[in-house]
């Protein structure tokens, strides 16, 4: 099999990507400058460490988590890195334009890089549903549309619902999941005869996917606490996330065994279920008052994740054409919803505790916020899906789905790679 990119893509991708990069450089030149007020170098280092954690999560964690396909592991890791690098650049500019631009130039701080990395993470979650079925040129489009949609969603939610950075970023789970699923729904679905083996997982890539899951597991507390304002909030977020992911690991492994007739543990279930607790407590991680509650949520999330992994792939494969091992989309959609429900429960407690007669109104606002996130995700996802179907992108033929050799140069081209 030829390892060359199709000629049309060879012409299209470098031109498209490099033109875009040149445009980004020009935008940075004219519209941005660094924050000149950094006086405390120790504080700078501490602040950078949080951003570093997020980058590790994105590049290594999500990069390797999506690399479990037998013949698509290289592309999964490298395309993730490409999307992260591009997404961060565009997200910094977009966030700056939306929040600061009327004042003149966009000031770049470590916090804006933190926000941008989290915005780019959204794309890496979504893309799990379409990796293997699209080329890099199409992924560039997906990055631009999704980061733009998420940035605008966050601004609208912040302005209408008066939410802080943490709250409006925590819609990322639901947003990314529904965005990815709606893009996948638009793409050609059936795998032609003879290529079914390509979307199967293999031992070594599955091990690297487990490595990705481990990195995400280790750094999830950093993700959930990155945008919180005070030390007490961050401390609570770190503790609660840690308890939740710890319990979801135990639940994932034992639940996976329980779900199998012979009591065997499924790699695919474990990859995503270990993260379940972190997603479920994301929205309210700083508000949960005691460890046992976070642990219960981790348990519930782990069970939902394993249950979803057992029963949903068949449906997702038929309707959306998502392979069995790409379970992040529906997993995050369920767990993100669970997280939002938990927050609404806390909101009701808050309103009751304040003796406030406006419970219905407050709950309605929260449901409105969630609905807005889902609607924008679905609409922008469908728009992206339609764009990706345009002939100009020279999408891989269905027979070349999940195949590294379409995109990469392998000196030895070993059969069965």
């Amino acid at each position: 099999m030829s390892s060359k990119y199709p000629r049309s893509v060879r012409r299209c991708l470098p031109l498209w990507a490099l033109t875009l990069e040149a445009a980004l450089i020009l935008l940075f030149y004219f519209f941005t400058h660094y924050d000149a007020s950094l006086e405390d170098q120790k504080g700078l280092v501490a602040s950078y460490q949080v951003g570093q954690d997020l980058t590790v999560m994105a590049a290594i964690g999500l990069g390797f988590l999506t690399s479990s396909f037998r013949r698509h592991s290289w592309s999964s890791v490298a395309f993730n890195l490409f999307m992260l690098a591009l997404g961060v650049q565009w997200a910094i500019l977009l966030d700056g334009f939306l929040s600061q631009f009327p004042s003149g130039k966009v000031v770049i701080t470590l916090f804006s890089i933190r926000l941008a990395t989290m915005s780019a993470l959204s794309v890496l979650i979504s893309v799990d549903a379409v990796l293997g079925k699209v080329n890099l040129a199409q992924l560039v489009v997906m990055v631009l549309v999704e980061v733009t949609a998420l940035g605008n969603l966050r601004m609208v939610i912040s302005n209408i619902f008066n939410t802080d950075y943490h709250m409006n970023m925590m819609h990322i789970y639901v947003f990314a999941a529904y965005f990815g699923l709606s893009v996948a729904w638009c793409l050609p679905k059936p795998l032609p005869e003879g290529t079914e083996d390509k979307d199967q997982t293999a031992t070594i890539p599955s091990l690297s996917a487990m490595l990705g899951a481990l990195f995400l597991w280790m750094f999830w507390p950093s993700f959930n606490s990155a945008l919180l304002r005070s030390p007490i909030e961050r401390k609570n977020a770190v503790f609660n996330t840690y308890y939740a992911v710890a319990v979801s690991v135990v639940t994932a492994i034992s639940g996976s065994s329980l779900a199998h007739p012979q009591g065997k543990i499924s790699k695919t279930y474990v990859h995503s279920a270990v993260l379940a607790g972190g997603v479920a407590v994301g929205t309210s991680c700083h508000l949960i008052p005691s460890p046992w509650l976070a642990m219960v949520l981790g348990l519930v999330a782990g069970l939902i994740s394993v249950g979803g992994a057992k029963y949903l792939p068949g449906c997702c494969n038929r309707v959306l054409g998502i392979p069995h091992s790409s379970i992040m989309g529906y997993n995050f959609s369920l767990l993100g919803l669970l997280g939002e429900i938990i927050y609404i429960v806390l909101l009701v407690l808050d309103t009751v505790g304040a003796g406030n007669g406006m419970i219905g109104f407050q709950v309605l606002l929260s449901i409105g916020e969630l609905s807005l996130a889902i609607v924008i995700a679905l609409m922008s996802g469908l728009l992206t899906g339609l764009l990706l179907n345009l002939k100009i992108w020279k999408a891989p033929h269905e027979a070349k789905y999940f195949d590294d050799q379409v995109f990469w140069k392998f000196p030895h081209l070993a059969v069965g790679f």
Epitope: A46, S47, N162, D164, R229, I232, E233, A354, M358
Partner: antibody, heavy 125, light 108 residues
Framework: QVQLVESGGGVVQPGRSLRLSCAAS????????MHWVRQAPGKGLEWVAV????????DYADSVKGRFTISRDNSKNTLHLQMNSLRAEDTAVYYC??????????????????WGQGTLVTVSS | DIQLTQSPSSLSASVGDRVTITCRAS??????LNWYQQNPGKAPKLLIY???NLQSGVPSRFSGSGSGTDFTLTISSLQPEDFATYYC??????????FGGGTKVEIK
Amino acid sequence: QVQLVESGGGVVQPGRSLRLSCAASGFTFRTYGMHWVRQAPGKGLEWVAVIWYDGSNKDYADSVKGRFTISRDNSKNTLHLQMNSLRAEDTAVYYCAREIASRGYSRYLYYLDFWGQGTLVTVSS
Amino acid sequence: DIQLTQSPSSLSASVGDRVTITCRASQSISSYLNWYQQNPGKAPKLLIYGASNLQSGVPSRFSGSGSGTDFTLTISSLQPEDFATYYCQQSYSTLALTFGGGTKVEIK
């Protein structure tokens, strides 16, 4: 006891710059968010800017965005406000204040529990 | 931004009187409202946080109530040192804290 002492105020011409400082003592400065709030002569309080405890994020009132920069040096227990392109309407007493976060069910409550005595900035030609 | 409207803007009262100041928010802010007292030429001082919690060191004659959009600061028995200006402040929208216009309590 908690003390916040502002300095750097004075008379300045429109379009010029001024840098205010706030020296903090009597508490662990690096664990608290800090604010600048101003009060024009005979008027009410107007929030100006906040900086998070670790300096990682800053938010500003629309009226000063792009002109004022809040910063802090946790190693010196000092808060700063760099004011550029000053206008006559920036004339006010500027207070620095310490932020406390208190847990609610659905979000945290923030309030300013200690304030400095203020420093007067007069923008006049 | 959330707007806070205080009423009255000024009032005259005598020592020993019961005084009530109201603060109305342009939208529901649950109980995320604080009250401050400012004496002439002095820095503001925190009285009440979270609509009804008394800050330590503040006399118990001060109390706060309300939730949603309507809030009240009550001084049960006015003392000479209470003649000052009172401000409400919301922290529901944390990206931009806002203050009410103030209520000046004067001696009748």
